[in-house]
C-alpha cells in the first residue's frame, strides 16, 4: 500500500481583505489513522490555525464533513481575512498517539492578502 | 470555565528580576496564542508580550524587548513572563490575557499579579 | 503602527440614559475592533468583538458599531455597574497589539 501522501493543490491563493479564503487540502490514505492541523508558517513559530481533534477555531470551518470517518478531505475556510493572515498554509497529517506526532505535510499555499476595494 | 491565574508578583529593586506563573485551566491551552499586558497605576492598557501555541513564536513591546522572555509549558498548562533588569516603570499590574484565535483578540483576562520597582 | 484614540476621556451619564464611547483608529482596521471593559481594582472583561458581536454573557445594553477607522461603543440605558474605563483594542495589524487611552464612564 503507498504511503500517505498531504496533497495542497494550490501554491497560491489572494484574498481581498474582509473576504473568506479557501485553502484545499486532501490526503491519498485513511492509514495512519491520526488528526489534521492546519499552520500558517513552519518551524517553532508556526501558528496554529485549525486542529481537527481539540480547540475552538472560529474563524475556520471545514469545507468537507471532516470528523466522517471515511472523510479524506481537510480544505478550510479562514473567515474575514486581514493583512495578518498573509502567509503560507500547511496541512499537516498526525499520526495518532500519546501525544499525536506529526506524519507528513502538505507543501504549502501561500496566502496573499490584497486591499479591500472601495 | 476558562480560568487564568497569575502569581509571582512582588516588590523589587531596579535591575533584578522576577518571573511572574499565570495557571491557565477550562480550555485546550495548548491551542492557543496568550499574552502579557500590563497596567501601571493610573495608566491604560500596555499590551507586553504574546506566545504562539506551540512555544516557538514571541513577539515583544519596544519596551521590553531584551529584557523580558515569554515562555510556556503547555504539559502544565502554565504562561511564564521572566522580567529581567528591572526598571521603575516597569511597574505595573501583568495581566495574563488568553488569545481568542491566533489572530485575534483577547477574551480572557486573569486577575493580575503587581509588580513594584522601586529602590 | 496604528494608534486609537478614544474620546471622550470621561463621560458622565444619568442611570437609564444612553452613554455613547467613539474609538478612531489612524488608518483602516477593518471590522477587526474589540471593546473591554475594566471596573475599578478589577480585570478587564470581553465585551464586543469584530466591531459589532457582543461576547458571552454580555446584556444586549452593549452594542458596538463601525468600521474601518471610526468605532462607536453605546450603552443603551446606563447602569450604575456600567460604570467603568473603556478600552478599544485593534487587531487587524500586529504586533504590537494596541489599546485606546480610555473612557470613563462615569454615573451622575
Known amino acids: 500500500e503507498e504511503e500517505l501522501q498531504v496533497i495542497q493543490p494550490d501554491k497560491s491563493v489572494s484574498v481581498a481583505a474582509g473576504e473568506s479564503a479557501i485553502l484545499h487540502c486532501t490526503v491519498t490514505s485513511l492509514i495512519p489513522v491520526g488528526p489534521i492541523q492546519w499552520f500558517r508558517g513552519a518551524g517553532p513559530a508556526r501558528e496554529l490555525i485549525y486542529n481537527q481533534k481539540e480547540g475552538h477555531f472560529p474563524r475556520v470551518t471545514t469545507v468537507s464533513e471532516s470528523t466522517k470517518r471515511e472523510n479524506m478531505d481537510f480544505s478550510i475556510s479562514i473567515s474575514n481575512i486581514t493583512p495578518a493572515d498573509a502567509g503560507t498554509y500547511y496541512c499537516v497529517k498526525f499520526r495518532k498517539g500519546s501525544p499525536d506526532t506529526e506524519f507528513k505535510s502538505g507543501a504549502g499555499t501561500e496566502l496573499s492578502v490584497r486591499a479591500k476595494p472601495s | 470555565d476558562v480560568q487564568l491565574v497569575e502569581s509571582g508578583g512582588g516588590v523589587v529593586r531596579p535591575g533584578e528580576s522576577l518571573r511572574l506563573s499565570c495557571a491557565a485551566s477550562g480550555f485546550s491551552f495548548s491551542s492557543y496564542a496568550m499574552n502579557w499586558v500590563r497596567q501601571a497605576p493610573g495608566e491604560g492598557l500596555e499590551w507586553v508580550s504574546r506566545?504562539?501555541?506551540?512555544?516557538?513564536?514571541?513577539d515583544y513591546a519596544e519596551s521590553v524587548k531584551g529584557r523580558f522572555t515569554i515562555s510556556r509549558d503547555n504539559s502544565e498548562n502554565t504562561l511564564y513572563l521572566q522580567m529581567n533588569s528591572l526598571r521603575a516603570e516597569d511597574t505595573a499590574v501583568y495581566y495574563c490575557a488568553k488569545q481568542y484565535d491566533w489572530n485575534g483578540f483577547f477574551d480572557y483576562w486573569g486577575l493580575g499579579a503587581l509588580v513594584t520597582v522601586s529602590s | 503602527e496604528t494608534v486609537l484614540t478614544q474620546s471622550p476621556a470621561t463621560l458622565s451619564v444619568s442611570p437609564g440614559e444612553r452613554a455613547t464611547l467613539s474609538c478612531r483608529a489612524s488608518q483602516t482596521v477593518g471590522s477587526k475592533l474589540a471593546w473591554h471593559q475594566q471596573k475599578p481594582g478589577q480585570a478587564p472583561r470581553l465585551l464586543i468583538y469584530d466591531a459589532s458581536r457582543r461576547a458571552t454573557g454580555i446584556p444586549d445594553r452593549f452594542s458596538g458599531s463601525g468600521s474601518g477607522t471610526d468605532f462607536t461603543l453605546t450603552i443603551s440605558s446606563l447602569q450604575t455597574e456600567d460604570s467603568a474605563v473603556y478600552y478599544c483594542q485593534q487587531y487587524y495589524y500586529w504586533p504590537p497589539y494596541r489599546f485606546g487611552g480610555g473612557t470613563k464612564v462615569e454615573i451622575k
Open positions: 506566545i504562539n501555541s506551540g512555544g516557538g513564536g514571541t
